[in-house]
């Protein structure tokens, strides 16, 4: 058994351009806290997989308010170490995730708002009992500087915390085959780490963590004598009256509570009061639980379905991740049809539809001409999600309600004069020009640029524009 310790030194903008904005402001003061998740081995595991080696949350840091105009400095950090106790051997190779969280402290009556600022991850080799290892990790524009180590809890020693050290029984030397425990030269290495609490007199082990009983003893820690006949005393056998081997122990003898839990007797058995970070009947399970408040963004925390997952965050729509920390980009699924614009409002999706389309996802193609009347003999033409009226001669406007002045646009070229006519307009051309809009010059030899003048019209006559 032992403890992984993480010391955060600084969290702030990384070097180079593009310094991040301060996460806090005068209007929204905030404070930081950190979460560490440890997994054995060097596997590239997803962030959502269980923190099998354990996890820890830091305390909240001091409240920080940005100074207007100042660049984001290194942000004030929580006091103390993040400690992740481990019950079994230290694996030597491990993967870590360190998350930096921001807690906004605005005037939200319903409690603080949390958001993930940065997440760094890595895979490392580390021997227990070694010195602090320093590390720098970058996440986007942020930089996290930290140190970490793994240390064994006495009496365990060694690079994996699997060897036990005991005070010397003789002043000068250790027992046969046992070495002194460096650096504790006054202690001797014990052969194997049996299960915590395994009776040294009546139990032994051939593998670390097990407790096998000598003949005549039983129980998970080999502290319960096997009786030769039925034993009536509720506290166990009493040798004189029942023929049992020896007086039996109380339920707390040998302290069945692991990881520093304290044992108290109950009428039926025993009860362990666990230190923070541990739970279970014998305080044998470590890691974050619902009581630590691991879910964000309105997630609800329930117990995991199997013993390895201490909690599950049930995320509301729009969020995902093991802690509901990731906002789902629901617009990336392109839910809006027919070119509609997608807006993720957090609590809901909205589609802003192009003209001519409607419905929650712009799925309805409106009949542009339905209920649209074009006045004065105009006809409705659908197109591009909007209706348009093709107006009869002499009328204009969106619905053909306006009487058009056909001469307003000065349609007659080369100084021709325009006359409004019941069926359109007529251009009276200046000398030397002809055509419906007086657009063709008359050649000096009398031939025109047109192949032939319509019958009954001489060059120079007014041309009617039909």
């Amino acid at each position: 058994a032992g403890v992984f310790e993480l010391q955060i030194h600084s969290f702030g903008p990384g070097p180079g351009p593009g310094a991040p904005r301060s996460p806090c402001s005068a209007r929204l003061p905030c404070r930081l806290f950190f979460r560490v998740c440890l997994k054995p081995g060097l596997s590239e595991e997803a962030a959502e997989s269980p923190c099998a080696l354990g996890a820890a949350l830091s305390a909240r840091g001091p409240v920080y308010t940005e100074q207007p105009g100042a660049p984001a400095p290194d942000l004030p950090l929580p006091d103390g170490l993040l400690q992740v106790p481990f019950r079994d051997a230290w694996p030597g190779t491990f993967s870590f995730i360190i998350e930096t969280w921001r807690e906004e402290l605005g005037d939200q009556i319903g409690g603080p708002a949390w958001s993930l600022l940065a997440r760094v991850a890595g895979r490392r080799r580390l021997a227990a009992g070694g010195p602090w290892a320093r590390d720098i990790q970058r996440a986007g524009a942020w930089e996290l500087r930290f140190s970490y180590r793994a240390r064994c809890e006495p009496p365990a020693v060694g690079t994996a915390c699997t060897r036990l050290c005991r005070p010397r029984s003789a002043p000068s030397r250790c027992g046969p085959g046992l070495r002194p425990c460096a650096p504790l030269e006054d202690e001797c290495e014990a052969p194997l780490v049996c299960r915590a609490g395994c009776s040294p007199e009546h139990g032994f082990c051939e593998q670390p963590g097990e407790c096998r009983c000598l003949e005549g003893w039983t129980g998970p820690l080999c502290t319960v004598p096997v009786s030769t006949s039925s034993c009536l005393s509720p506290r166990g056998p009493s040798s004189a009256t029942t023929g049992c081997l020896v007086p039996g122990p109380g339920p707390c003898d040998g302290n069945p509570c692991a990881n520093g839990g304290s044992c108290s007797e109950t009428p039926r058995s025993f009860e362990c009061t666990c230190p923070r970070g541990f739970y279970g009947l014998r305080c044998e399970v470590s890691g974050v639980t619902c009581a630590d408040g691991p879910c964000f963004n309105g997630g609800l925390c329930v117990g995991g379905a199997d013993p390895d997952s201490a909690y599950i965050c049930h995320c509301p729509p729009g969020f995902q991740g093991s802690n509901c920390e990731k906002r789902v980009d629901r617009c990336s699924l392109q839910p809006c049809r027919n070119g509609g614009l997608c807006l993720d409002l957090g609590h809901a999706l909205r589609c802003r539809c192009r003209a001519g389309f409607a419905g929650p996802r712009c799925e309805h193609d409106l009949d542009d001409c339905a209920g649209r009347a074009c006045a004065n003999g105009g006809t409705c033409v659908e197109g591009g999600g909007a209706h348009r009226c093709s107006c009869a001669l002499g009328f204009g406007g969106r619905d053909c309600r306006e009487r058009a002045d056909p001469c307003a646009a000065r349609p007659c070229a080369h100084g021709g004069r325009c006359y409004a006519h019941f069926s359109g307009l007529v251009c009276a051309c200046a000398p030397g020009y002809m055509g419906a809009r007086c657009e063709f010059p008359v050649h000096p030899d009398g031939a025109s640029a047109l192949p032939a003048a319509p019958p009954g019209l001489r060059p120079g006559d007014p041309q009617r524009y039909l």
Partner: antibody, heavy 121, light 107 residues
């Protein structure tokens, strides 16, 4: 201060529906789940379901899944619980309660005063 | 569903004495266990969350312990206002379930 104020007592006939309201004040309404719990006369507490006001998403007790509808009106900070196909055994006091929610805590920290629904022919 | 069983159904204790209320789950609820107090004609009131976490405004004489399937609510020195019905509730899995309650009455 946090308050949950529920609508008044109702008397309904078997087969009918009842809609109970719960108006919240004193906290950010959209940030906390609201749960519904009922208590039959002289009996214990029974969880019916929850609603998250910001999105309207719900968790339901399977026992009531086809009969309970929970809705909300964010403009008035009110949640509603409608129970249909009423039977005599639905006679109970119906409570709404605010769930702490912060950090995922699935714990009911503030309760409404309760609404007595009596189902009788 | 997880069945929560409270014992005893009724507990008679004198004011000033210690009261111990028990709650047992049909399967492990880890530490997802909460305690409520209810007085006649009133809504329940949260006393303890997550086995032993205190609630602001709740007197320190209320404490909780246990884990897994066995839980205890202890009232160290009973006051007259403590006589009520007490419920445990698990939030380990759906549906959320409550114990049947322990009525604490004056001896």
């Amino acid at each position: 201060q946090v308050q949950l104020v529920q609508s008044g007592a109702e008397v309904k006939k078997p087969g009918a529906s009842v809609k109970v309201s719960c108006k919240a004040s004193g906290y950010t309404f959209t940030s906390h789940w609201i749960t519904w719990v009922r208590q039959a006369p002289g009996q214990g507490l029974e969880w019916m379901g929850d609603i998250y006001p910001i999105s309207g998403s719900t968790n339901n007790n399977e026992k009531f899944r086809n009969r309970v509808t929970m809705t909300r009106d964010t403009s008035t900070s009110t949640v509603y619980m409608e129970l249909s196909s009423l039977r005599s055994e639905d006679t109970a006091v119906y409570y709404c309660a605010k769930i702490i929610t912060v950090g995922g805590a699935y714990v009911m920290d503030y309760w409404g005063q309760g609404t007595l629904v009596t189902v009788s022919s | 569903e997880i069945v929560m069983t409270q014992s005893p159904a009724t507990l008679s204790v004198s004011p000033g004495e210690r009261a111990t209320l028990s709650c047992r789950a049909s399967q492990s609820v880890r530490n997802n266990l909460h305690w409520y107090q209810q007085k006649p004609g009133q809504a329940p009131r949260l006393l303890i969350k997550y086995v032993s976490q205190s609630i602001s405004g709740i007197p320190a004489r209320f404490s909780g312990s246990g884990s897994g399937t066995e839980f205890t609510l202890t009232i160290s020195s009973l006051q007259s206002e403590d006589f009520a019905v007490y419920y445990c509730q698990q939030s380990n899995s759906w549906p959320l379930t409550f114990g049947g309650g322990t009525k604490l009455e004056i001896k």
